[in-house]
């Protein structure tokens, strides 16, 4: 089209723009390493950093790993997008008891309202079932239809929860079981006997609890016994031990009857953000042994930025380019500023001997 020619010509003399025939207009040329957010970018703000698959660009313009929903009790709510993380939620029939960023750290099965109570609000992915006392005239044993039926095949019968009485409300929520395959299998073997005075065949109200063993003769060891991978917490509840299954974690102490497993970052890494009994974010230890550092003389007085290397690698201990900028990286690890200025040293703790100091002692 002849009328388009002048527009095309205006682009040729401008290296920061190009002509897009499909849309018949001048477009802004994104700088190397940046990618357009639309077909024909008009300005620098229409360009963005491109992250690797399963990473997204966070508010601080950093490529950050999307959370994974690979646990059995989680499902994907929203996918990993270029500018937002994947979001996970508890699978149907479960609710989140301990939330985590864009996910849930711990899911429990929804409670079934016990005799004398009816469902006030059904459970959701975020909230447990809320029960309230049945209206007068309803038989307590059949206050809710579920309590008058044997579980049909294909459904997971729930453990009868211990009622909770909040001070401010007559309604109550009752967590039932830990959200693991183990818990599901255990739950499927249980049946409720709402009217039976005996506790035989009735599951414990604690998540992860298995029936207590009778005391061995002459033994005082009659403690509550939790299922494998659960421990008895200070409040006497069976609680799931943390898992060290992430690639960057190793087991520090095992799951015991009265204490959780604890995890730590594998050797060569340091915990940048902790979590209960574990580390939420491990990063490669960002400082090289003093004797491996090479520093050109013209950089002796400069601050240098090192990017912590991706998981599974060690810092290469070489300074970054002359401008002191770290190379762009899509690694989720945190970058750390290095100041080359030498200073006096503190001594080593007797309880923690370390490698040679820079003095060679």
């Amino acid at each position: 089209f002849p009328q388009d020619r002048p527009f095309e010509d205006t682009c040729h003399g401008n290296p920061s723009h190009y002509y897009d025939k499909a849309v018949r207009r001048c477009c802004y040329r994104c700088p190397m390493g940046l990618f357009p957010t639309q077909q024909c970018p008009q300005r620098p703000t229409d360009c963005r950093k491109q992250c690797e698959p399963d990473y997204y660009l966070d508010e601080a313009d950093r490529c950050t790993a999307c959370v994974t929903c690979s646990r059995d009790d989680l499902v994907e709510k929203t996918p990993c997008a270029w500018n937002s993380s994947r979001v996970c939620e508890c699978r149907p029939g479960m609710f989140c008891s301990t939330s985590a960023v864009n996910s849930c750290a711990r899911c429990f099965f929804h409670s079934v309202c016990p005799a004398g109570m009816i469902v006030k609000f059904p459970g959701t992915a975020q909230k447990n079932t809320v029960c309230e006392p049945a209206s007068p005239g309803v038989s307590p044993a059949c206050a809710s239809p579920e309590n008058c039926k044997e579980p049909s095949s294909g459904t997971i019968p729930q453990a009868k929860p211990t009622p909770v009485s909040p001070a401010t409300s007559s309604a109550s929520t009752m967590p039932v079981r830990g959200g693991t395959r183990l818990a599901q299998e255990a739950a499927s073997k249980l049946t409720r006997a709402p009217d039976s005075p005996s506790s035989v065949g009735r599951p414990s109200s604690d998540p992860g609890l298995s029936p207590t063993q009778p005391c061995p003769e002459g033994s005082g060891d009659c403690r509550k016994q939790c299922e494998p991978d659960y421990y008895l917490d200070e409040a006497g509840r069976c609680t799931a031990c943390v898992s060290c299954s992430r690639d960057d974690l190793v087991e520090k102490t095992p799951c015991a009857w009265n204490s959780s497993r604890t995890c730590e970052c594998r050797p060569g890494m340091i915990c940048a953000t902790s979590a209960t009994n574990s580390c939420a974010r491990c990063v490669p230890y960002p400082i090289c042994a003093a004797e491996t550092v090479t520093k050109p003389q013209d950089m002796a007085e400069k601050d240098t930025t090192f990017e912590a290397p991706p998981l599974g690698t060690q810092p290469d201990c070489n300074p970054t380019p002359e401008n002191g900028e770290a190379p762009a990286s899509t690694s989720p690890t945190q970058s750390l500023l290095v100041d080359s200025q030498a200073s006096k040293t503190l001594p080593i703790p007797t309880s923690a001997p370390v490698a040679l100091s820079s003095t060679g002692k």
Partner: nanobody, 122 residues
Framework: EVQLVESGGGLVQPGGSLRLSCAAS????????MAWYRQAPGKGCELVSI???????YYTDSVKGRFTISRDNSKNTLYLQMNSLRAEDTAVYYC????????????????WGQGTTVTVSS
């Protein structure tokens, strides 16, 4: 036994400055790396900065250019100079010896000292 005592915290307005100190005792001759960690209310323990035995220093992105870590062997003391403070810097700050060895688990807050509280609020 290694003992660390943190001090210097307080209430400061956004944009203000504080200097934290960590007095160390129970050490032998040479200098390990030392670290500052912090724990905000309801959050996990977070690495802030490391200083190596030979004085090289490391900072997390969020404090880069605002905080300065230093050490003085003659006084057996570690410092953290905090400038341009923000509300998100509100936390209890802890120092930790030899983080390469001691801070692989999520337990580098409160293991050696009681910490010092920094509150940034207008």
């Amino acid at each position: 036994e290694v003992q660390l005592v943190e001090s210097g915290g307080g209430l400061v307005q956004p944009g203000g400055s504080l200097r934290l100190s960590c007095a160390a005792s129970g050490f032998t001759d040479d200098g390990p790396d030392m670290a500052w960690y912090r724990q905000a209310p309801g959050k996990g323990c977070e690495l802030v900065s490391i200083i190596s035995a030979d004085g090289r220093t490391y900072y997390t992105d969020s404090v880069k250019g605002r905080f300065t870590i230093s050490r003085d062997n003659s006084k057996n003391t570690l410092y953290l100079q905090m400038n341009s403070l923000r509300a998100e810097d509100t936390a209890v700050y802890y120092c930790a010896p030899d983080p390469r060895r001691n801070c692989r688990g999520g337990d580098c807050c409160g293991n050696w000292g009681q910490g010092t509280t920094v509150t940034v609020s207008s």
